[in-house]
């Protein structure tokens, strides 16, 4: 709904009245809206809500909301949806992180190593070799080294000492019983406080091929986000009448994968600098989609003197 009410706290912007040439000071419109009519000598500016697919993050004096970034390419998920106040933000699915502008699985720490630092959507797991008194018998991207089973606390003895890869094996002393019943199990050595830990380089254990471009990729360096869809259209192959069944068929891996090229199968391939899509603010967003429309159209959009 158009909104005319001016708040005492709202900022102002300067506008040149085309009819009179007069420079007027108008109240800005709130975030999520834009100026549909500038103020005049006799009237307040009029604000309207951003249409679907557009947004303004701040109070502003602009005449058109910013286009949201393109949909997140498969298999990325929407960290933030496109809404009147926010641009769309994309992130890697769980168990993965952004690496070389694509999603890679978190490193699997091998047996004998444990997680030193958990992985996030932007950082890989960090592994460390299990310290004395601890072990890891499972390759995992989430598990820390576990302390050896304390055999003594179970009135048992260590039959086979643990290693970096195996737990202590506990059993009864032969003098108490004629047979031993080994039972693996949490630590007989105290964990040393000042032991050196060895970090495994993450790349060592990333599954091979995660950063390769063997999937018929025509791009050797992957873009930050790639949407291979028609410019200005929304991909939707629900209707064969629209003739777009093959458009955007291969979004995963964030790379171009052998599309049939033709005048109606153009691809948008854009590298986004960290500042470009955020109006001069540094973005914490892992990934944003490219903007809709012709690349030149958007160059001025995110730093508008009337928006700041």
């Amino acid at each position: 709904q158009p909104e005319q009410k001016a708040s005492n706290l709202i900022g102002t912007y300067r506008h040149v009245d085309r009819a009179t040439g007069q420079v007027l000071t108008c109240d800005k419109c709130p975030a999520g809206t834009y100026v549909s009519e500038h103020c005049t000598n006799t009237s307040l500016r009029v604000c309207s809500s951003c249409p679907v697919g557009t947004f303004t993050r701040h109070e502003n004096g602009i005449e058109k909301c910013h286009d949201c970034s393109q949909p997140c390419p498969w298999p990325m998920i929407e960290k933030l949806p496109c809404a009147a106040l926010t641009d769309r933000e994309c992130t890697c699915p769980p168990g993965m992180f952004q690496s070389n502008a694509t999603c890679a699985p978190h490193t699997v720490c091998p047996v004998g190593w444990g997680v030193r630092k958990k992985g996030t959507e932007t950082e890989d797991v960090r592994c460390k070799q299990c310290a004395r008194g601890t072990f890891s018998d499972v390759p995992s991207s989430v598990m820390k080294c576990k302390a050896y089973t304390d055999c003594l606390s179970q009135n048992l003895v260590v039959i086979k000492p643990g290693t970096k890869e195996t737990d202590n094996v506990c059993g009864t002393l032969p003098s108490f019983s004629s047979s031993t019943s080994p039972s693996p199990g949490t630590a007989i050595f105290p964990r040393p406080e000042h032991m050196e830990t060895h970090e495994v380089p993450s790349s060592t254990y990333v599954p091979k091929g995660m950063n390769s471009t063997e999937s018929n990729s025509s791009a050797s360096v992957r873009p930050k986000v790639l949407s291979s869809i028609q410019e200005g259209t929304v991909p939707d192959n629900t209707s064969s009448a629209r003739g777009k069944e093959d458009v955007n068929k291969t979004l995963p891996n964030l790379q171009v994968v052998n599309h049939q090229q033709g005048p109606h199968h153009r691809h948008i391939l854009k590298l986004l600098p960290s500042m470009e899509a955020t109006g001069g603010e540094k973005s914490s967003t892992p990934i944003k989609g490219p903007k809709r429309g012709h690349p030149r159209q958007n160059l001025h959009k995110h730093f508008d003197i009337n928006e700041h």
């Epitope: 298999p75 699915p93 995660m210 063997e214 192959n237 891996n253």
Partner: antibody
Framework: EVQLLESGGGLVQPGGSLRLSCAAS????????MSWVRQAPGKGLEWVSV????????YYADSVKGRFTISRDNSKNTLYLQMNSLRAEDTAVYYC???????????WGPGTLVTVSS | DIQMTQSPSSVSASVGDRVTITCRAS??????LAWYQQKPGKAPKLLIY???SLQSGVPSRFSGSGSGTDFTLTISSLQPEDFATYYC?????????FGGGTKVEIK
């Protein structure tokens, strides 16, 4: 605990229609792509369709294109599959699944059986 | 479309055996491959994602390897509860496609 629960399956005549629903709980539904996968009796798994987190962008297997429509209501945490012009070969258990870890289907519903027969 | 060819289609094995199932993609899919286990009347269960990452809660006797076009699922020491059908699936491009399945039966 993540849960997906399909409903709406049943017996339908060839050429008929059916609408499947999948109620999601235990996770934030709206950021995720969601999918339908089916399995004909005694056969393997076949991917049917997937929908973008905020809807609008949809992809289909060739075998169902033009007949099935996937949709979602993020306010209700529900995924839908509208099936029209049903054929005998559409008879299957239909699973709702979430592409999560590594884009693999990390959560599945128990499935709902759709039987197309006269 | 990317075809996924799984082999063998069935394997007879005993408890304690090492079982290897292979999956070949008709074109490179990097590491966008998952393995599932399915038991009769149940929904599939994710075992391995991204070719070699073990899904949380899955026993460490399951492991995956490979990238590009050739992938392997290995069960290092078969347990009674592992008798089931196993499927590979590529998540690289639409349409997403599954292998034909490998039934692991009791010898």
């Amino acid at each position: 605990e993540v849960q997906l629960l399909e409903s709406g399956g049943g017996l339908v005549q060839p050429g008929g229609s059916l609408r499947l629903s999948c109620a999601a709980s235990g996770f934030t539904f709206s950021p995720y792509w969601m999918s339908w996968v089916r399995q004909a009796p005694g056969k393997g798994l076949e991917w049917v369709s997937v929908i973008y987190p905020s809807g609008g962008h949809t992809y289909y297997a060739d075998s169902v294109k033009g007949r099935f429509t996937i949709s979602r209501d993020n306010s209700k945490n529900t995924l839908y599959l509208q099936m029209n012009s049903l054929r005998a070969e559409d008879t299957a258990v239909y699973y709702c699944a979430r592409p999560g870890f590594g884009a693999a289907f990390d959560y599945w519903g128990p499935g709902t059986l759709v039987t197309v027969s006269s | 479309d990317i075809q996924m060819t799984q082999s063998p289609s069935s394997v007879s094995a005993s408890v304690g055996d090492r079982v290897t199932i292979t999956c070949r993609a008709s074109q490179g899919i990097s590491s966008w491959l998952a393995w599932y286990q399915q038991k009769p009347g149940k929904a599939p269960k994710l075992l391995i994602y991204a070719a070699s990452s073990l899904q949380s809660g899955v026993p460490s006797r399951f492991s995956g390897s490979g990238s590009g076009t050739d992938f392997t699922l290995t069960i290092s020491s078969l347990q009674p509860e592992d008798f089931a059908t196993y499927y590979c699936q590529q998540a690289n491009s639409f349409p997403l496609t599954f292998g034909g399945g490998t039934k692991v039966e009791i010898k």
